[in-house]
């Protein structure tokens, strides 16, 4: 029968950044197709990506319903052109994913410095509050909305003329730092979730420097 050529999916891997969440697996299909199911620990299975020849499935719409839940997915393998066919045990071959808890495991995306404004010897640096695909009351929540004070930002800043860095932290999206008058500074930020034990940090933002378009300078 056609089922003898069907192989189970393997290397099921969650790829998730700022809650945009995709399940990936192997192998590339040869004469077979896949369907994915996702469930919370206590919930019912929901099917997604029906009879696909892809080896990935976007599950964002499901996990954003409750990012603090723990999810499990499974990938079913069917013979191409004969999706009603089942394996020797009377059901299609499938493989389970690792468990995935979005709130604890989604990677923090690279942050962006939205603006900086100098007033005398103080600079206010603002980090863009990135929109996620998590919804509440029909509106998309920002990263800060979702994580609240669990999310902090670390600012690295240095004089354009030197390499010696300083750093500051905030549990909002704004920094107010002291600078030397008449000096230009460069800035980079990193997102951190201190309560995590893995995936705690984002990559660093692109560097922004004073004297470029993004900032504003006011001499008081």
């Amino acid at each position: 029968s056609g089922t003898t050529n069907t192989v189970a999916a393997y290397n099921l891997t969650w790829k998730s950044t700022n809650f945009k969440t995709i399940l990936e697996w192997e192998p590339k299909p040869v004469n077979q197709v896949y369907t994915v199911q996702i469930s919370t620990k206590s919930g019912d299975w929901k099917s997604k990506c029906f009879y696909t020849t892809d080896t990935e499935c976007d599950l964002t719409d499901e996990i954003v319903k409750d990012v603090k839940q723990t999810y499990l997915a499974r990938v079913f393998s069917y013979p191409a052109g004969n999706v009603e066919s089942t394996g020797s045990a009377g059901e299609p071959l499938y493989e389970n994913s690792p468990e995935f808890t979005p709130y604890l495991e989604t990677n923090l995306g690279q942050p962006t410095i939205q603006s900086f404004e100098q007033v005398g010897t103080k600079v206010n640096v603002t980090v863009e509050d990135e929109r996620t695909l998590v919804r509440r009351n029909n509106t998309f929540l920002s990263l800060r909305d979702v994580f609240g004070k669990d999310l902090i930002y670390t600012l690295y800043y240095w004089k354009s003329s030197s390499s010696g860095k300083k750093t500051a932290k905030t549990n909002t999206n704004e920094f107010l730092i002291d600078v030397d008058k008449g000096e230009n500074y460069c800035f980079s930020v990193q997102a951190v979730i201190p309560s995590r034990t893995v995936n705690r940090k984002s990559t660093d933002s692109p560097v922004e420097c004073m004297g470029q378009e993004k900032g504003e300078f006011r001499e008081i």
């Epitope: 690295y156 300083k166 932290k169 905030t170 201190p194 034990t197 705690r200």
Partner: antibody
């Protein structure tokens, strides 16, 4: 079990250099900064600087720029502090510690450095 | 740089009493403050983080309060093992300065 194991005591001559190591285990090395702190005999704690193993960024206290150099070896999950041009004022206990952003939650046992001719 | 002024430098107290140590920051640090205990010949041990949060495994007789520039650390019902050194540290901006320390002595 989370551990930070520092290298043993050092007795060196003035003008020499020394390297102190801090071997970490029991946690994801690149997820936490490693801080270095100095304590002279009977004195308070002085922050030397830190290194972020994730991106290699180092931050130093102004008093230790040019004196201390912080590095890591990700493959062995070890942090290093190199101290140069040593004088008797550098005689102290040096600690490494894990930074959880809000505090230093695990510390090495300390490395005693004695600078004497 | 942010200066941390810790007081008192030393304090005598009896078993079962309560003591309070204060740390003043030279500028606002929100709640970016930690408290440590250090026993003779040992490494510091984290007691309180984010000004008010008790670290794992730390007895509930230790507590922290404050935000902005004024912070307090309290030990209620002192035990024999509490008569050691205590330090505050601001972790808001570099350099991440420590207070000068408080030596708690048995009366």
């Amino acid at each position: 079990e989370i551990q930070l194991q520092q290298s043993g005591p050092e007795l060196v001559k003035p003008g020499a250099s020394v390297q102190v190591s801090c071997k970490t285990s029991g946690y994801s090395f690149t997820d936490y900064n490693v801080y270095w702190v100095r304590q002279s005999h009977g004195k308070s704690l002085e922050w030397i600087g830190y290194i972020d193993p994730y991106n290699g960024i180092t931050i130093y206290d102004q008093n230790f720029k040019g004196k201390a150099t912080l590095t890591v070896d990700k493959s062995s999950t070890t942090a290093f502090m190199h101290l140069n041009s040593l004088t008797s004022d550098d005689s102290a206990v040096y600690f490494c510690a894990r930074d959880v952003t809000t505090a230093l939650d695990f510390w090495g046992q300390g490395t005693t450095l004695t600078v004497s001719s | 740089d942010i200066q941390m002024t810790q007081s008192p430098a030393s304090q005598s107290a009896s078993l079962g009493e309560s003591v309070t140590i204060t740390c003043l920051a030279s500028q606002t640090i929100d709640t970016w403050l930690a408290w440590y205990q250090q026993k003779p010949g040992k490494s510091p041990q984290l007691l309180i983080y984010a000004a008010t949060n008790l670290a794992d495994g730390v007895p509930s007789r230790f507590s922290g309060s404050g935000s902005g520039t004024k912070f307090s650390f309290k030990i209620s019902s002192l035990q024999a093992e509490d008569f050691v050194n205590y330090y505050c540290q601001q972790v808001y901006s570099s350099p991440f300065t420590f207070g000068a320390g408080t030596k708690l002595e048995l009366k």
